[in-house]
């Protein structure tokens, strides 16, 4: 069964800056990755970035930088200032659309009492939805 993992980290250098990393553990070809916050994409969440393996990347504030890390993982840096900046308990979700498995999504937030800049290695987050 495919899995999606999500890792959220607060940057030590900029305490209101977040890095979200997501990965897909599945057998298919990824056709789209959508990163959202405030809940799953399409269920009250707000899209931060969309990464397409052939058409490139689109991102929206407060997203500062979305990138592919490997063929099956991505990272997103969020700007940490202004009214739309994230807070420590914000939920971030990553949805991977792949062929032939379909769409798989998982969410995560900053671990409680986590030290800035430190985080556990990514582990698969609970799968919230498989379309």
């Amino acid at each position: 069964t495919p899995e999606v993992w999500v890792q959220v980290r607060m940057e030590a250098t900029e305490l209101s800056s977040f890095t979200i990393r997501c990965g897909f553990l599945g057998s298919g070809s990824i056709s789209l990755v959508t990163v959202s916050w405030g809940g799953p994409n399409g269920a009250g969440g707000t899209t931060l970035a969309v990464l397409h393996p052939e058409r490139g990347i689109r991102q929206w504030a407060p997203a500062r930088q979305a990138r592919w890390e490997t063929q099956s993982s991505i990272s997103l840096i969020l700007e940490g200032s202004g009214a739309s900046s994230p807070c420590a308990n914000t939920t971030f979700c990553c949805k991977f659309a792949s062929f032939p498995e379909g769409s798989w999504e998982a969410c995560g937030s900053l671990p409680p009492s986590s030290d800035p800049g430190l985080s556990a290695p990514p582990t698969p987050a609970p799968i919230l939805r498989a379309d």
Partner: antibody
């Protein structure tokens, strides 16, 4: 137009160090990871490592730790590969390649030939 | 790191022939395999990503397939301009690793 322009060929003596450059145009290196690769004559490609120009964080193949140092100057859009304690085994063509906007190396530099000889 | 074993090392074929190159990963890499073509004196160029997705502008005579540990790359009808070295590469996990390459020569 996206381009990665690498510095010219180098001939250096054993034990010396060398710094190769990769100048990006048509995009901002802060938007990608810059990877460096090594290719010896009639041999395969070896991955040296990658740098995140945004923060300078780099990751290396264990075989190149202590041999290679990756840096980047985001103000001038240039990535660098420094190689130290050179030996004949370091004689090769070195490539920079971008990764991140797409999930593969979509653009490569033309390569820099490094010859280590006394 | 993951070892990518590519075979054969050399292929001598005639124009119009079909060729197949295989790449075997030492552990599962799902579909995180890319195939590159490197013509003499040039940098590598992407042909296939995700094991089977043809890159923009790549002729449809080039195909890739596979999943897990076993991957194949084929040229259905070899043409003279296909003279090159072909590499597989995995980016499933760091360090990125490449197959040893297959040198394709045309009779």
């Amino acid at each position: 137009e996206v381009q990665l322009q690498q510095s010219g060929a180098e001939l250096v003596k054993p034990g010396a160090s060398v710094k190769l450059s990769c100048t990006a145009s048509g995009f901002n290196i802060k938007d990608i990871y810059m990877h460096w690769l090594k290719q010896r004559p009639e041999q395969g490609l070896e991955w040296i490592g990658r740098i995140d120009p945004t923060n300078g964080n780099s990751e290396y193949d264990p075989r190149f730790r202590g041999k290679a140092t990756l840096t980047a100057d985001t103000s001038s859009n240039i990535a660098y590969l420094q190689l130290s304690s050179l030996t004949s085994e370091d004689t090769a063509v070195y490539y920079c390649a971008r990764f991140g906007i797409y999930p593969y190396f979509d653009y490569w530099g033309q390569g820099t030939t490094l010859t280590v000889s006394s | 790191g993951i070892v990518m074993t590519q075979t054969p090392k050399f292929l001598l074929v005639s124009a119009g022939d079909r060729v197949t190159i295989t790449c075997k990963a030492s552990q599962s890499v799902n579909k995180a395999v890319v195939w590159y073509q490197q013509k003499p004196g040039q940098s590598p160029k992407l042909l296939i990503s995700y094991a089977s997705n043809r890159y923009t502008g790549v002729p449809d005579r080039f195909t890739g397939s596979g999943y897990g540990t076993d991957f194949t790359f084929s040229i259905s009808t070899v043409q003279a301009e296909d003279l090159a070295v072909y590499f597989c590469q995995q980016d499933y996990s760091s360090p990125w690793t490449f197959g040893g390459g297959t040198k394709l020569e045309i009779k």
